[in-house]
């Protein structure tokens, strides 16, 4: 099977991917409204109605020669401008910059609150099975199983940072050397990419929105797939990696410091820390085969204990075991040893919500999954549309051009390399590379930043994590100094080999063309979004994993010809781009091959076949939902539904569906290009419920 | 009150069996040791064996294995032992006794339980 | 096994004297000692634990001392009631044994 089906397709008819409008208004040249409705010689318009509320922003096309769908829009100030305002209206309208401020401010806290929530959910769900994942011996010698491991436990857990301190706690104790802890740490650079993807799934209701979103995302993740599948071969090959960590380690004389500054966190832990506190060590204890920590909660209970040094009687297998026979007894059944032992005292209870619930990991996790992402996805839409009312006119030119436009000549260069360093510098500061890119995807999504500017921002969020591990490994106990700066300089080399490997040279941007390509495949078809996260932060790791476990000759077995076809695929694929004339005529497309097989249309047709009967009742719910927010705010016209709701009804009412008329707050026609492809469910459902 | 309470003297032919019960009162029964130490007439005090009711682990001195035998019913809070091919030497006062946690040392103790070996 | 040796068998005071009777391990047990006290037709009663320390009730004119192989039951003052057989018993190794008794009598 082709690999990226329609890629191919991807530039040369841009119209297939454009919608009516980017969000409520028609795709049209530089010209106002009233041009368009008296001079019909332009490109012809459909009318459409502006909600008042939902957004003062006009989004235009600029006039290309051909309308590109990855050209940002232009956001256009439809509002009243500020010499022709009032005394009472700037007053009005300073008050409302500074509200959209406090409110953008406040849902930003929220959005950043619930990813760490977000990451303690996963922990609880999956984090005991994810240490689990360590304890196996086969890392050591498999650096394709470290890879997936690492993969895999930063997916579940949806924290680098727990994985790399796993990997360092378990080379400190020396369960792990280095070498193998250098490919867990490349595969746990791919699992964080997996939280701005998800991120990006939340905005999948606008078409052209999401396919910058969802671009801007997984150019994280081609950028970090890349450079694994390059340099993981050469790190088992040369173990460039491990030696030029050791150089450093060895030539500095290091004394273990003060804490890695706390910065955004210093913010965020007193709200999050009320919400659910998670014992860390207890994933770090399976992983080193603790067999007690397997039966450990990690909600974390008590929060103020005391620890005291004292000797206790404790049994021991036999004589063997006693350091001299005077310091054994027995009691007549077991022998006895006097061993010192910390005794923890419990003095007071932590202040979460989930304290005296008693509740297990699993329930815990799951709750604090739905309302985190119920809190993320809820936040996202609030920034986006805050966004979307605040960059208009003057304001996103100036944001626009600042962020987007090179240096002038000869120094053009020389912008990207300063974006790497913002990216690193912002990640810095958050002490968080899924925070930073997940708040960099919206932006992405609205058009704000180019995704050719968000790869180097996203790039510089690599090496800014990598830093934050440096510091923190500098304030490592002793016992750990070594093993800890080691592994957090393998991490920041490996980032640097791949920007070295995909950004200096333009020609070598893959990632980028990549992420292109995967856009214009999801905003064509949405539910490959969600297949792709699947497939590639779980399907192939779990894959791999298992054909690991069976050992070599299997995974071989299997494994080669797969990268046969795979390559073979994008020989094929190389050549039929660029020389054709070369292939048999039979070669120069894929038709040759079933339609299933270099085409997403028959896999949409059955997806719409099985999640058809759920669109409707879901976008009846969202309708309700809008209603009651109107009704609870007293604004008939504040809320309107996601666009594919609107999609599915345009489909229906083309196949003489009766679709609910619309009410006060539905203010809104659209247009039959702004359809897209969504077909719409074969069950006639009418959201009567309204 | 920790009490133990040893049933009634026995008087049994060689090579019989006799099975002697202590019963424990007052204390968390599964939390102790009970050892069975055995005090021949005019002779002094021989541990026989232990056993732990909360986990059923036994252990004996080897003269006795193999003719001891030590059993606990948790629900009724007794130990019993049981001896085997009994021989004139087997005459003896049977004590049982509980050990302090983390020690052989005994605190409390039963009775006694008097057998007498004869044909 | 460990052999527990104790000395004198039999040993005749008055009341008001002072009586020590040692016991000697056949090997180091390290202070896990056990002194008892056995009356005609009463159970037998624990005096001292580890060696010298007195259990919870014992007059305290009753002290143990002692290390490594050597120890000794001391006491300071001897009082009627005090006229029984002495044991000792160590808990260092399985199986645990018994001193063979020393009975003391009123002179």
């Known amino acids: 099977m082709a690999p990226w089906p329609e890629l191919g397709d991807a530039q040369p008819n841009p119209s297939k991917y454009l919608e009516g409008a980017t969000s409520q208004q028609p795709i049209t040249p530089d010209k106002s409204k009233e041009t368009n409705k008296t001079d019909n010689t332009e490109v012809p318009v459909t009318k459409f109605e502006l909600l008042p509320t939902y957004s003062t922003a006009t989004l235009i096309e600029e006039p290309t020669e051909v309308d590109d769908p990855w050209n940002l829009p232009t956001l256009q100030d439809s509002g009243i401008k500020w010499s022709e305002r009032d005394a009472k209206g700037k007053i009005l309208c300073v008050f409302q910059g500074i509200g959209r401020l406090i409110l953008l401010l406040g849902f930003l806290y929220f959005f950043v609150c619930s990813l760490d929530v977000l990451s303690s959910a996963f922990q609880l769900v999956g984090g005991k099975m994810a240490g689990q994942f360590f304890s196996n011996s086969s890392i050591m010698s498999n650096p394709l199983l470290g890879l997936v491991i690492g993969v895999l436990v930063t997916v579940f857990v949806q924290s680098s940072s727990t994985s790399t301190s796993i990997v360092v706690s378990m080379v400190a104790s020396s369960l792990l050397t280095v070498r193998a802890a250098i490919p867990i740490i490349m595969g746990a650079n791919i699992g964080t990419s997996i939280t701005n993807t998800i991120v990006a799934l939340m905005q999948v209701g606008d078409r052209s929105e999401f396919r910058r979103a969802f671009a801007g995302a997984t150019v994280h993740d081609f950028f970090n797939w890349l450079s694994v599948l390059v340099l993981l071969p050469v790190e088992v090959a040369t173990h460039y990696l491990e030696v030029v960590t050791q150089l450093i380690v060895e030539s500095f004389h290091f004394k273990n410091g003060e804490d890695a500054p706390d910065l955004l966190k210093v913010i965020t832990k007193p709200f999050t820390k009320l919400i659910v506190q998670l014992d860390k060590k207890v994933i770090s204890q399976i992983a080193m085969n603790d067999e007690t920590a397997k039966n450990k909660s990690l909600v974390k209970i008590w929060c103020k204990t005391f620890t005291n040094m004292t000797q206790m009687n404790v049994t021991v297998p036999s004589m063997a075991n006693c350091t001299s026979h005077s310091l054994c007894w027995t009691d007549g059944i077991q022998i006895w040893t006097m061993k010192n032992v910390t005794y923890k005292e419990n003095i007071a209870k932590c202040q979460h919500i989930f304290v005296n619930f008693h509740l297990p990991d699993l329930a815990v996790g799951i709750i604090l999954l739905i309302i985190s992402l119920l809190v993320l996805c809820g936040c996202l839409i609030m920034i986006v549309k805050i966004l979307g009312s605040v960059l208009k006119g003057q304001v996103a030119t100036v944001i626009k051009k600042t962020i987007n436009t090179d240096f002038p000549f000869p120094f053009a260069w020389l912008t990207g390399y300063l974006a790497i360093l913002v990216g690193a510098g912002m990640t810095f500061i958050v002490q968080s590379s899924s925070v930073f890119t997940s708040a960099l995807t919206p932006l992405i999504g609205i058009g704000v930043i180019t995704i050719e500017r968000a790869y180097p921002l996203t790039l510089g969020s690599n090496i800014g994590t990598t830093t934050t591990a440096i510091l923190a490994a500098l304030a490592s106990p002793g016992n750990t100094l070594r093993s800890s700066l080691q592994i957090a300089l393998c991490h920041f080399f490996f980032n640097i080999s791949g920007i070295l490997l995909w950004y200096p040279i333009p020609f070598t941007r893959l990632p980028i063309r990549m992420a292109k390509g995967l856009g214009n495949i999801s905003a064509k078809y949405r539910w490959f979004a969600v297949f792709y996260l699947i497939i590639f932060f779980f399907l192939i790791p779990l894959t791999v994993f298992g054909l690991s476990l069976a050992g070599w000759p299997v995974l071989v077995g299997v494994g080669v010809p797969v990268v046969f076809i795979i390559i073979l695929v994008l020989c094929l694929r190389l050549l039929q781009s660029r020389c054709p004339r070369v292939l048999p005529k039979k070669l120069q497309n894929w038709n040759f091959l079933p339609l299933c097989m270099h085409s997403l249309k028959p896999w949409d047709a059955v997806i719409s076949k099985f999640t058809g009967p759920f669109q409707m009742p879901c976008c009846c719910c969202c309708r309700v939902c809008c209603r009651v927010c109107c009704l609870l705010c007293g604004c008939p016209k504040c809320c309107r539904c996601s666009k594919c709701c609107q999609d599915l009804e345009e489909g229906q009412e083309a196949q003489g569906v009766p679709v609910k008329a619309p009410e006060t707050f539905d203010n809104i026609t659209i247009s039959r290009e702004a359809q897209g492809e969504v077909r719409a469910p074969d069950s006639k459902t009418e959201c009567t419920a309204l | 009150e920790v009490q133990l309470v040893q049933s009634g003297a026995e008087v049994v032919k060689p090579g019989a069996s006799v099975k002697m019960s202590c019963k424990a009162s007052g204390y968390t029964f599964t939390g102790y040791i009970i050892h069975w130490v055995k005090q021949a007439p005019g002779q002094g005090l021989e541990w026989i064996g232990a056993?732990?009711?909360?986990?059923?682990?036994?252990s004996y001195k080897q003269k006795f294995r193999g003719r001891a035998t030590l059993t606990a019913d948790t629900s009724t809070s007794t130990v019993y032992m049981e001896l085997s091919s009994l021989r004139s030497e087997d005459s003896a006062v049977y004590y049982c006794?509980?050990?302090?946690?983390?020690?052989?040392?005994?605190?409390?103790w039963g009775q006694g339980t008097l057998v007498t070996v004869s044909s | 096994d460990i052999q527990m040796t104790q000395s004198p068998s039999s040993l005749s005071a008055s009341v008001g004297d002072r009586v020590t009777i040692t016991c000697s391990a056949s090997q180091d047990i390290g202070n896990f000692l056990n002194w008892y006290q056995q009356k005609p037709g009463k159970t037998v009663k624990v005096l001292i634990y580890?060696?010298?320390s007195l259990y919870s009730g014992v007059p305290s004119r009753f002290s143990g001392s002692g290390s490594g192989t050597d120890y000794t039951l001391t006491i300071s003052s001897l009082q009627p009631e005090d006229f029984a057989t002495y044991y000792c018993q160590q808990y260092s190794k399985l199986p645990l044994t018994f001193g063979q008794g020393t009975k003391l009598e009123l002179k």
């Open positions: 580890y060696a010298s």
């Open positions: 006794a509980r050990g302090e946690t983390a020690r052989a040392t005994f605190a409390y």
């Open positions: 056993i732990y009711p909360g986990s059923g682990a036994t």
